[in-house]
């Protein structure tokens, strides 16, 4: 009976474990007449014997690091020593036993990272070797942090990937490393082999010494520039610098101007393009950016602030064409009679502003000149020599110059004499009755028509009625306007009216004139009037604290988490019931009572944030009036979506037979945000049994290579495996298929036989 | 054109004060930085601190913190290095020099003040 | 004792070639892309030859040029002239707002 260790002379593979002392025979080659004896040539290295019956063996133990196959032949000879059959190729795999230990290639190693550097991004590699077999768990080296020196609040700042040994920032490294505070740290990496998984895995250590560098991409100082400048633009006013050469540099308008007149250049500099104009705009705030060459933005951008400094470029201007002011006759020395208020559009509190008064010239000249003075700063005008007789002159026309250090500006003023006021206003009526009237009339209506009179002369300050509620409204919820031909009053509603505050209000009016009265007369009782307000109850809804409530919660939160609160109150002073409208996905639950919000289900940002929903108080009892405001619900990222690809790839071939390597590109993409700086995906293939064949190579945060390495690939449908890993925390990995077809090609694109239509790629490579 | 223009040549003896200046004209004074440097005899140059008197936002090197003290009147494009007690070590030309924001390099130069400093 | 190393001297004939090589660390020189060199003739203010690594200011012949290489910047004159006789000062930015001078070369044109 030929069994499993005997047989024919035939080609044959054996697998042998290395490193274990010989317990049994290989094989029993039986020989067929007429071979009597058998010969054993090749890589035998003294360990292989065959004896002349057949009997294979070897006589001490193997070492797969020395040699990891042994190519061995095996021929039957006869009496004479003839060879009649064979030589037949005898193969010897040695299988890997872990009997070596990983050993890293430097003992130390320096490399330097820089300060808010993207986490995951790797800045130095460690380097460990196995002499074991890498296809088997024995040579698969696992990389870790043993510690970090100094560990500041037990925040790991560096973090390894365990296959690779790239070591780059954690979130928190990037955030928080300062060199300033610590410029230098120490790393203790071990690696072990058995992928790091087994109590009898061996290991090996190396120490990492790290200088944080600062980030130089920071915001420049205020930079200050004068407006209407002569001289040639572009003017550089100030530089950015991205850490390292390459960047491309933009500006951004947050202000979205007409007119931006700032560039940048690709060394950073950024220039004025035109002279400004403080008057238009005294200051500006934009934004410089640094983007990668695929036109991602490498970091934050930074904010620019120009201030333009003012210079005297604007006249005084008057604030009309001709100021008209009153006087009455018997006005004493030294009384006020108007202020000219002239304007200049430089800066404020400035010389370049600041303004002189004086008179140049008085028309007529009756009974003298100098009637008047001006103060010289305060532009107010006041009588100087004697009272004024309007049957004399009534009227006075001033011209009067307004100047800053470098212009002067005519400004005219026409004085009018008027009676005296010596007669006060009187109201028609002084008490107006009881007016009701319902909280929510309409703001803006008029609620009373009140009437004074005054026998001064007419069309002056002096008979002019303003009418002020001196008593009774000190919400300020009535005014009253007056008609300026007939001295009318119309009582207007100012704010809304409300009976739980004020059900009964006592208004009292007074008239008064804008001219002061003449010495000796005073207002009396005939100058004031009253009404009274009373307001009727009208059952109102719930009032909202806010129109918007908003909360920020993340999207991991647990069920049950209180999410936000909102807040309303009845004017009546009722109880409310508070319930939630339109949450249409079922995520949360409103406390009737207290109007806590509470999440109910899980919540995901990538289904869209914020969440709004609308939120309903409603009185408990009464009439159930209600009233709905807005809640919304942002909701912050975690990273919980795995990378994917960002397009259908299916269709993708190469025309078979390959004349050279080829590639494809593809491109990947998550759900999760990325703020500036935009995904920064690593890629890798899904399989070891990939390597052959493929292999994949990062172009940018979100493309990669798909690449051929050779051109010995058979006709038909390749599935091809690729790892994208996102780098998040946690870092999520993704598993996507690229279907890669390799077929022949007429004029470029696949060709199938007539009938033969499925699946038919598109898009060659 | 750009000019920085530093006070004459001063004696002084330990003990004493000293304010020396450094005027700047032929561009907009505020928008940059002034530096200090100190030469001292047979030596080389060493980066004493700056200021930017847009704001007076001072910063000095580690090894003058203390020693000196740099101001700016931005009203009248001028700097200032000032000494309270001065010592015979600070005998030395000292140097004003435009320094440019976010690229630290220097680039024009006042024509230097020589302080001597007996004991 | 100055952060940056230079060596004191070096020469070279009208014509030849120099250069100067300023040594830092990776928290210098290694570590920013803002190394400048400066010629200073004795008496005078100094002069900026090179900033940011390897740029020339206008009216800076390009006889001058600069590379940096790890943590080791360094000066190339080309032509010698006797003109370019002077003492050159490398510098760097060290971090954390503060500015480093080398000890300075003395160019010597034979």
């Known amino acids: 009976q030929e069994g499993k260790f005997s047989g024919p002379l035939k080609p044959m593979t054996f697998s042998i474990y290395e490193g274990q002392e010989p317990s049994q025979i290989i094989f029993q080659f039986k020989a067929n007449p007429p071979a009597v004896t058998f010969e054993l040539t090749g890589e035998t290295d003294n360990i292989f014997v065959i004896e002349r019956e057949g009997l294979l063996y070897y006589n001490r133990a193997l070492d797969r690091e020395t040699r990891s196959t042994h190519n061995l032949q095996v021929a039957a000879l006869d009496a004479n020593g003839i060879i009649v059959e064979g030589p037949v190729p005898i193969t010897i795999k040695v299988k890997d036993i872990n009997d070596n230990r990983p050993t890293f290639l430097q003992s130390k190693y320096e490399g330097s990272v820089r300060q808010n550097s993207r986490p995951g991004k790797p800045f130095l590699y460690v380097n460990a070797t196995d002499l074991d077999d890498p296809a088997t768990p024995n040579g698969q080296l696992y990389y870790q942090i043993v510690i970090q020196l100094p560990m500041i609040n037990n925040v790991m700042y560096f973090q390894i990937n365990n296959k690779t040994g790239a070591i780059s920032l954690t979130r928190e490294g990037s955030q928080e490393l300062n060199p300033a505070k610590n410029p230098s740290y120490n790393l203790v990496i071990s690696v072990k082999d058995m992928g790091g998984q087994s109590e009898n895995s061996f290991s090996d250590t190396t120490s990492v010494d790290i200088i944080v560098t600062e980030n130089i991409w920071k915001a420049p100082k205020p930079v200050e520039m004068v407006e209407n400048s002569t001289d040639p633009h572009p003017i550089k006013i100030t530089q950015v610098r991205w850490n390292d050469p390459g960047a491309q540099y933009s500006l951004v308008d947050k202000e979205k101007l007409p007119r931006f007149p700032f560039s940048i250049d690709q060394e950073g500099d950024i220039y004025v393009t035109q002279p400004l104009d403080r008057e238009e705009k005294d200051a500006y705030v934009f934004y410089a950016v640094a983007k990668d060459e695929y036109g991602k933005p490498l970091s934050y951008p930074l904010e620019i602030h120009v201030k333009v400094k003012d210079i005297n470029d604007n006249p005084p201007t008057c604030p009309s064409p001709v100021t008209v002011f009153e006087v009455q006759e018997n006005e004493r020395l030294g009384n006020s009679i108007g202020t000219l208020t002239a304007h200049d559009r430089d800066e404020e509190n400035t010389a370049n502003s600041f303004l002189n008064y004086r008179i140049v010239e008085q028309t007529p000249k009756l009974p003298m000149d100098g009637l008047f003075l001006i103060q010289t700063y305060a532009g107010m005008l006041q009588l100087a020599k004697q009272s004024l007789k309007k049957q004399d002159t009534p009227q006075y026309n001033l011209t009067i110059e307004v100047s800053d250090k470098d212009f002067k500006t005519l400004c005219f003023v026409q004085i009018n004499v008027i009676d005296i006021n010596d007669q006060i206003p009187i109201f028609e009526k002084s008490d107006y009755g009881n007016l009701t009237l319902a909280e929510d009339t309409n703001i803006g209506s008029t609620i009373l028509t009140i009437q004074a009179t005054d026998a001064d002369e007419p069309f002056t300050g002096s008979s002019k009625i303003l009418y002020h509620i001196i008593k009774g409204d000190s919400e300020g919820r009535l005014g009253v306007d007056t008609d300026p031909h007939t001295n009318t009053g119309y009582v207007i509603i100012k704010k809304p009216l409300d009976f739980e505050t004020a059900a009964v209000s006592n208004i009292v009016f007074k008239a008064e004139n804008p001219e002061p009265l003449v010495f000796g007369v005073k207002y009396n009782a005939s100058s004031f009037a009253k009404f009274t307000l009373i307001v009727t109850d009208v059952n109102e809804a719930p009032q909202f604290s806010q129109h918007v409530f908003q909360a920020k919660v993340s999207e991991d939160v647990a069920i049950g988490t209180k999410v936000g609160n909102v807040t309303a109150k009845d004017p009546e002073g009722l109880d409310i019931s508070y319930s939630l409208r339109g949450d249409t996905r079922g995520w949360l639950k409103i406390d009737h009572v207290t109007g806590e919000i509470f999440s109910v289900a899980p919540l995901d940002r990538e289904a869209g944030s914020p969440y709004r929903v609308q939120v309903v108080a409603t009185e408990v009892g009464g009439s159930s009036l209600s009233s709905v405001s807005e809640f919304h619900l942002i909701l912050m990222d975690v990273n919980d979506n795995p990378p994917r690809l960002a397009k259908d790839y299916t269709g993708l071939f190469f025309c078979h037979p390959l004349s050279a390597p080829g590639s494809l590109i593809f491109e990947a993409t998550d759900d999760d945000q990325h703020l500036f700086r935009g995904p920064h995906f690593t890629f890798s293939l899904g399989s070891g049994s990939l390597q052959n064949d493929w292999e994949v190579s990062k172009i940018n945060g979100t493309h990669a290579r798909l690449s051929t390495r050779h051109t010995e690939f058979e006709e038909r449908e390749y599935v091809v495996l690729i790892r994208i890993n996102d780098g998040g925390r946690p870092p999520l990995e993704g598993i996507v298929s690229l279907p890669v077809t390799f077929c022949s090609c007429v004029e470029g694109s696949c060709f199938r036989p007539a009938g033969h239509q499925t699946g038919i790629p598109t898009v060659g490579m | 054109q750009v000019q920085l223009v530093q006070s004459g040549a001063e004696v002084r003896k330990s003990g004493e004060s000293l304010k020396i200046s450094c005027e700047g004209s032929?561009?907009?004074?505020?928008?940059?930085?002034i530096a200090w440097v100190r030469q001292m005899p047979g030596k080389g140059l060493e980066w004493m601190g700056i200021i930017y008197p847009g704001d007076s936002d001072t910063r000095y090197s580690p090894s003058f913190q203390g020693q000196v003290t740099i101001s700016a009147d931005k009203s009248i494009s001028t700097a200032y290095l000032q000494w309270n007690t001065l010592k015979a070590s600070d005998t030395a030309m000292y140097f004003c020099a435009r320094h440019v924001d976010s690229t630290w390099y220097i680039d024009h130069w006042g024509q230097g003040t020589l302080v001597t400093v007996s004991s | 004792q100055p952060v940056l190393t230079q060596p004191p001297s070096a020469s070279g004939s009208p014509g030849q070639s120099v250069t100067i090589s300023c040594t830092g660390t990776s928290s210098d020189v290694g570590g920013y892309n803002f190394v400048s060199w400066y010629q200073h003739h004795p008496g005078k203010a100094p002069k900026l030859m090179i900033y940011e690594v390897s740029k020339r200011p206008s009216g800076v012949p390009d006889r001058f040029s600069a590379s940096k290489s790890g943590n080791t910047a360094s000066l190339t004159v080309s032509g010698l002239q006797a003109d370019d006789e002077a003492d050159y000062y490398c510098?760097?930015?060290?971090?954390?707002?503060?500015?480093?001078f080398g000890g300075g070369t003395k160019l010597t044109v034979l």
């Open positions: 510098s760097s930015y060290a971090g954390n707002d503060n500015l480093q």
């Open positions: 032929g561009y907009s004074f505020g928008n940059y930085w």
